[in-house]
């Protein structure tokens, strides 16, 4: 167990031109707050996927009113750290999302309004117990500077917070085979209490005799890497050789969701859908009011003036969930016809149509040949959203306006001479060669390399190429 700590240092205009306008004004004073969402491993940073490692909301910053005419400075920040406790081992690699929210303090009906100013995301490697890591992230014209670290809660120590420490029994040194616990040099590593043989790198335990696996490892001793490719059953065959997840209790067995939350399995773990008034990985956090700003992505919070009455988040278009935390994937309904590309812009859906199709949903098939004339007797052929001309002999180009020079490509081999002909080209072959393009040598005895020359044509005669 341990705590991930995040310190925001500054949020303001980034370097370079195009400084953003101040988010607050004399008419609409506002204050900032931050939300951090953590996910284990180098998982997708999609804002709507659950914060499986945990999430935290900062306090509100000081009220800020823009000075007219002044550029947006670094905005005043909330005091203190954002702390995300983690119960199990620290995964070492994690993804984060940090959102900067603005709370407008004007005369809004129904209380303050929240809007998302900036969202930054990243994937990082971080060992617990190390120094503060510093980071700069840019979101549009805004720049966010922050530090973060993961620290273990005693008695846990180590880069994954999986080793345990106990006070020394003897004043001078630790027992046989046990090291002092840095940074608690006056303590000693606790004797191993995990199941015998439990992998020290990939397994850990919280109770004597157990062996729980870090993400990506399985087996009774956490020595088998998880392979997701060769598993046949929903949780994989029970086989130590394939390295698949062993069938057995699913992540939702025993319902880990508290306070009436409902559990659903995800590819990696589980997700709790919490009843109103509760949130957190396992719906364990309660007593939320609208003052805590529980509605994300611009959702409007109504009710919930005191911890005993539930609040309701009214979500803006494109978001759902009890806290508006889930983005609606409106493109999954495949609204774009005829192979059009769906773009969810948040405020609206757009279809980018393939050539030859139009309309809000690419439902109109354009007549490619309408109004397209092919010159010199060419005929228009429709296809693939673009018109094409099939040209009469002797003509070429997109609209058959160019007179084709059949000899331009030097089609006659072995020094044959090319003559343009109304129906194509004719090759006059050099002595010793024959064929439509003079490609065949004539054998010294008069026989050709082909079967016989066509009747009526002697070797060496000009060959007409149709």
């Amino acid at each position: 167990a341990g705590v991930f700590e995040l310190q925001i240092h500054s949020f303001g205009p980034g370097p370079g031109p195009g400084a953003p306008r101040s988010p607050c004004s004399a008419r609409l004073p506002c204050r900032l707050f931050f939300r951090v969402c953590l996910k284990p491993g180098l998982s997708e940073e999609a804002a709507e996927s659950p914060c499986a490692l945990g999430a935290a909301l900062s306090a509100r910053g000081p009220v800020y009113t823009e000075q007219p005419g002044a550029p947006a400075p670094d905005l005043p920040l909330p005091d203190g750290l954002l702390q995300v406790p983690f119960r199990d081992a620290w995964p070492g690699t994690f993804s984060f999302i940090i959102e900067t929210w603005r709370e407008e303090l004007g005369d809004q009906i129904g209380g303050p309004a929240w809007s998302l100013l900036a969202r930054v995301a990243g994937r990082r490697r971080l060992a617990a117990g190390g120094p503060w890591a510093r980071d700069i992230q840019r979101a549009g014209a805004w720049e966010l500077r922050f530090s973060y670290r993961a620290r273990c809660e005693p008695p846990a120590v180590g880069t994954a917070c999986t080793r345990l420490c106990r006070p020394r029994s003897a004043p001078s040194r630790c027992g046989p085979g046990l090291r002092p616990c840095a940074p608690l040099e006056d303590e000693c590593e606790a004797p191993l209490v995990c199941r015998a043989g439990c992998s020290p790198e990939h397994g850990f335990c919280e109770q004597p005799g157990e062996c729980r696996c870090l993400e990506g490892w399985t087996g009774p001793l956490c020595t088998v890497p998880v392979s997701t490719s060769s598993c046949l059953s929903p949780r994989g065959p029970s086989s130590a050789t394939t390295g698949c997840l062993v069938p057995g209790p699913g992540p939702c067995d025993g319902n880990p969701c508290a306070n009436g939350g409902s559990c659903s399995e995800t590819p990696r773990s589980f997700e709790c859908t919490c009843p109103r008034g509760f949130y957190g990985l396992r719906c364990e956090v309660s007593g939320v009011t609208c003052a805590d700003g529980p509605c994300f992505n611009g959702g409007l919070c109504v009710g919930g003036a005191d911890p005993d009455s539930a609040y309701i988040c009214h979500c803006p278009p494109g978001f759902q969930g009890s806290n508006c935390e889930k983005r609606v994937d409106r493109c999954s309904l495949q609204p774009c016809r005829n192979g059009g590309l769906c773009l969810d812009l948040g405020h609206a859906l757009r279809c980018r149509c393939r050539a030859g199709f139009a309309g809000p949903r690419c439902e109109h098939d354009l007549d490619d040949c309408a109004g397209r004339a092919c010159a010199n007797g060419g005929t228009c052929v429709e296809g693939g959203g673009a018109h094409r001309c099939s040209c009469a002999l002797g003509f070429g180009g997109r609209d058959c306006r160019e007179r084709a020079d059949p000899c331009a490509a030097r089609p006659c081999a072995h020094g044959g001479r090319c003559y343009a002909h109304f129906s194509g080209l004719v090759c006059a072959c050099a002595p010793g060669y024959m064929g439509a393009r003079c490609e065949f040598p004539v054998h010294p005895d008069g026989a050709s390399a082909l079967p016989a020359a066509p009747p009526g044509l002697r070797p060496g005669d000009p060959q007409r190429y149709l």
Epitope: P15, R125, L126, A127, G130, R134, S147, A182
Partner: antibody, heavy 122, light 107 residues
Framework: QVQLVQSGAEVKRPGASVKVSCKAS????????MHWVRQAPGQGLEWMGW????????NYAQKFQGRVTMTRDTSISTAYMEVNRLRSDDTAVYYC???????????????WAQGTTVTVSS | DIQMTQSPSSLSASVGDRVTITCQAS??????LNWYQQKPGKAPKLLIY???NLETGVPSRFSGSGSGTDFTFTISTLQPEDIATYYC?????????FGGGTKVEIR
């Protein structure tokens, strides 16, 4: 007390490599970044990069990328800095220095070792 | 990279004098500035961080000020043991860069 002690002076030929060590004591080695800074004779200070002893992550100044390697051995609380393909202009005093690990936006050096003189000469 | 320009490069002053050194950054570095003292043949020593905060154990005659691009380091009453070269160093971003140094001598 908090202390950093570096290895002794080195004389090297151009094209050779040198590896300087920096032993930490009096504090938790893995809890603080270690910077490396050099100073050519009669010149100013030049930052070379840092290493996070906890994870082994490094960040090098562009000028030294590909030619400098920073490593550590946590079991003996020692950081190392190796410079390859030495040139005469690498002649300098090389310092390791601890970053104070402030929570604020900060990079600096609050504890310095005595320095290691590296002379590159044919 | 951010350039740090220190001036003067050297100065001579009498014991008891007020000494001022300036450091200019090539771009806005907020208050992300350190000042170090290096005595001949020794390693540098951190005196001031965050442009104006005195490091623990450093005498109060040393002070720093400034923000953005222009910074000042002051020794209010020069002492004989202050003979050294003084460097500024920014930490707005990586790479960290130092000023060229100011050598302070006793007249």
């Amino acid at each position: 007390q908090v202390q950093l002690v570096q290895s002794g002076a080195e004389v090297k030929r151009p094209g050779a490599s040198v590896k300087v060590s920096c032993k930490a004591s009096g504090y938790t080695f893995t809890g603080y970044y270690m910077h490396w800074v050099r100073q050519a004779p009669g010149q100013g200070l030049e930052w070379m990069g840092w290493i996070d002893p906890n994870s082994g992550d490094t960040n090098y100044a562009q000028k030294f990328q590909g030619r400098v390697t920073m490593t550590r051995d946590t079991s003996i609380s020692t950081a190392y800095m190796e410079v390859n393909r030495l040139r005469s202009d690498d002649t300098a005093v090389y310092y390791c220095a601890r970053d104070p690990n402030r929570r604020s936006w900060y990079y600096g050096m609050d504890v310095w070792a005595q320095g290691t003189t590296v002379t590159v000469s044919s | 990279d951010i350039q740090m320009t220190q001036s003067p490069s050297s100065l001579s002053a009498s014991v008891g004098d007020r000494v001022t050194i300036t450091c200019q950054a090539s771009q806005d570095i907020r208050n992300y500035l350190n000042w170090y003292q290096q005595k001949p043949g020794k390693a540098p020593k951190l005196l001031i961080y965050d442009a104006s905060n005195l490091e623990t154990g450093v005498p109060s005659r040393f002070s720093g000020s400034g923000s953005g691009t222009d910074f000042t380091f002051t020794i209010s009453t020069l002492q004989p043991e202050d003979i050294a070269t003084y460097y500024c160093q920014h930490y707005d971003n990586l790479p960290l860069t130092f000023g060229g140094g100011t050598k302070v001598e006793i007249r």
